[in-house]
Interface confidence: low
């Protein structure tokens, strides 16, 4: 004869209040004959849950049909799980007697548990932009969760960051729990593009962790390169000279040419290009009037990034006697196809002021 | 700031229907759920029932069911209490609570409360 | 249902003192206590949570202890603002049930 196993599989079961529980309990052998019965705890106190027999058990139903002659599944469903449905379930096989039935054999125990999922995780990064090479602080933060074991991790582009502090409130216990991690995140050039990740894993999520994201575009800010270049030929009376920005984000930009370190005010033709790493470059091009008595012109482009300090660069004008003396109709080549080009630019400047103008 | 906010005091007769709110502000209101409490004057405090504002679904305290109807309107963050055929022993204050922490979870303790309707059942 | 009993109804007590209130519950319901102070014509305030968790800005001299079946809150310097009713709650198993209450007077 096949000794009778009691088999509760799960150790421990997780529920949220107001939903319904199945606790599983199969039987190895249908011997001796007897009842299985379902109770809460263990000793004399021990509380009744289900007996098919007798009793009125309203809010529990079997899995199978117990009636069946061959059934060897007594798992059972509670509904409308509350607070004080938690304690240790097991299913106990009795042998039938006369005039009792005596108890002869019980699984291992199911402990039930409440469980709460926690939050979807909200990221928040710093107040302030920061340029490359310095630490920003992300927060992650999850809240209403149970039991207190929970797992985060913090991801930089998928790789996992180590960097980071995290405590889960309140320490002692309590129906549900909070958890705040603090990752700090270097900042790299190239970061516009990059996101921060948390995630969160706890055991009701059952193996699909929750995740919050923040874009390090939010946080970084890459200060631009400026280089000023005169172009080497005149158009008629006019030099072209070219200022150019390079590598910075946000887009928030203010450009102004200064002649001899008077502000000009006239429409300068610019473009605005975006690089694969998300920063920007931003082109302006100004022309200059040149005369035998215009011989010391400073000029001067001043760019203010995104509210920062002004940042400018100058440059003397070279006004060879050869470019005095060149004139707007000479020999059609390069200085024919650089007024073509100007052209384009004056003509196509109006449509990127909006981009000049924007704070 | 989260607030609790509740309908004004209620004088009926015996026999009468009574219908407090409860207005919710400052959270997401079908994130946690609601319990009523009550307090006859110069008493302790009952708790009535819970409430899943998610789900609607309530949990009542076996004194308060069957004149006792509680329900939402989660389009407008607020919960009610309904009190059919009023006695003399339900002149009392009532007060909303709410859970502590996110649904899912069970209720508890209470942190937020409304600052309580008088109502007073007289012939 | 499980009772918390309260069994000191009042307390007399004087400014500066060490006061202890006490409650027991009927059955064992771990730490799942609450406590709770109301003043005349207003709502209970939570003061303390799961026995012994201080709620955020409540004065360090209110205490909670205590599990299973008997749990104490106390005042350790007492003062003239502390003077009102005072609740356990457990939330152990429904239906949730609160302390009739201990109310602090001045000697």
């Known amino acids: 004869e096949e000794e009778l196993q009691m088999i509760q599989p799960e150790k421990l079961l997780l529920v949220t209040v107001g939903k319904t529980a199945t606790l599983h309990c199969t039987v190895t052998s249908l011997l001796p004959v007897g009842p299985v019965l379902w109770f809460r705890g263990v000793g004399p106190g021990r509380e009744l849950i289900y007996n098919q027999k007798e009793g009125h058990f309203p809010r529990v139903t079997t899995v199978s049909d117990l009636t069946k002659r061959n059934n060897m599944d007594f798992s059972i469903r509670i509904s409308s799980i509350t607070p004080a449905d938690v304690g240790t379930y097991y299913c106990v096989k009795f042998r039938k007697g006369s005039p009792e039935n005596v108890e002869f054999k019980s699984g291992p125990g199911t402990e039930m548990a409440l469980g709460a999922k926690p939050s979807a995780p909200v990221v928040l990064g710093p107040a302030a932009r920061t340029t490359p090479e310095h630490t920003v602080s992300f927060t992650c933060e999850s809240h209403g969760f149970s039991p207190r074991d929970i797992t985060l991790k913090w991801f930089k582009n998928g790789n996992e960051l180590s960097d980071f502090q995290t405590n889960v409130d309140p320490t002692g216990q309590s129906v549900a729990y909070s958890i705040r991690s603090t990752a700090r995140v270097v900042l790299d050039p190239w970061d516009v593009r990059s996101q921060v990740i948390c995630e969160v894993a706890h055991v009701t999520l059952q193996g699909d962790p929750l995740r919050g994201t923040a874009n390090l575009s939010e946080a970084i800010r890459v200060p631009p390169t400026l280089e000023v270049t005169q172009q080497p030929m005149r158009v008629g009376n006019q030099v072209n000279v070219t200022c150019q920005v390079r590598k910075f984000y946000p887009q928030s930009l203010q450009l102004t040419w200064s002649e001899n370190g008077n502000v000009c005010q006239r429409e300068t033709a610019s473009t605005l290009t975006e690089n694969k790493d998300g920063t920007y470059n931003w082109t302006s091009w100004f022309l200059v009037n040149i005369s035998d008595q215009r011989d010391d012109v400073v000029l001067t482009c001043q760019v203010k990034h995104d509210g920062q300090l002004a940042v400018s660069k100058r440059l003397a004008l070279e006004v060879t006697v050869h470019q005095k003396d060149q004139s707007s109709d000479a020999t059609p080549g390069p200085a024919s196809s650089l007024t073509a080009l100007l052209l384009i630019a004056v003509l196509l400047g109006p449509i990127y002021v909006p981009w000049k103008q924007k704070t | 700031q989260i607030q609790l906010v509740q309908s004004g005091p209620e004088l009926k007769k015996p026999g009468e229907t009574v219908k407090i709110s409860c207005k919710a502000s400052?959270?997401?209101?079908?994130?946690?759920?609601m319990s009523w409490v009550k307090q006859a004057p110069g008493k302790g405090l009952k708790w009535m029932v819970w409430?899943?504002?998610?789900?609607?679904?309530?949990t009542y305290a076996d004194d308060f069911k069957g004149r006792f109807a509680f329900s939402l309107e989660t389009s407008a963050s607020t919960s009610y209490l309904q009190i059919n055929n009023l006695k003399n022993e339900d002149t009392a204050t009532y007060f909303c609570?709410?859970?502590?922490?996110?649904?899912?979870?069970?209720?508890?303790?209470?942190?937020?409360w409304g600052q309580g309707t008088l109502v007073t059942v007289s012939a | 249902d499980i009772v918390m009993t309260q069994s000191q109804k009042f307390m007399s007590t004087t400014i500066g003192d060490r006061v202890s209130i006490t409650c027991e519950a009927s059955?064992?319901?771990?730490?799942?206590v609450a406590w709770y102070q109301q003043k005349p014509g207003q709502s209970p305030k939570l003061l303390i949570y799961?026995?012994?968790n201080r709620y955020t800005g409540v004065p360090d001299r209110f205490t909670g202890s205590g599990s299973g079946t008997d749990f104490t809150l106390t005042i350790s310097n007492m003062q003239s603002e502390d003077l009102a009713n005072y609740f356990c709650q457990q939330y152990s198993a429904y239906p949730f049930t609160f302390g009739s209450g201990t109310k602090l007077e001045v000697k």
């Open positions: 400052g959270y997401t209101f079908t994130t946690y759920g």
């Open positions: 609570a709410r859970d502590p922490h996110y649904y899912g979870s069970s209720p508890a303790w209470f942190v937020y």
């Open positions: 409430i899943n504002t998610y789900s609607g679904v309530p």
């Open positions: 059955q064992i319901v771990g730490i799942a």
């Open positions: 799961s026995a012994s």
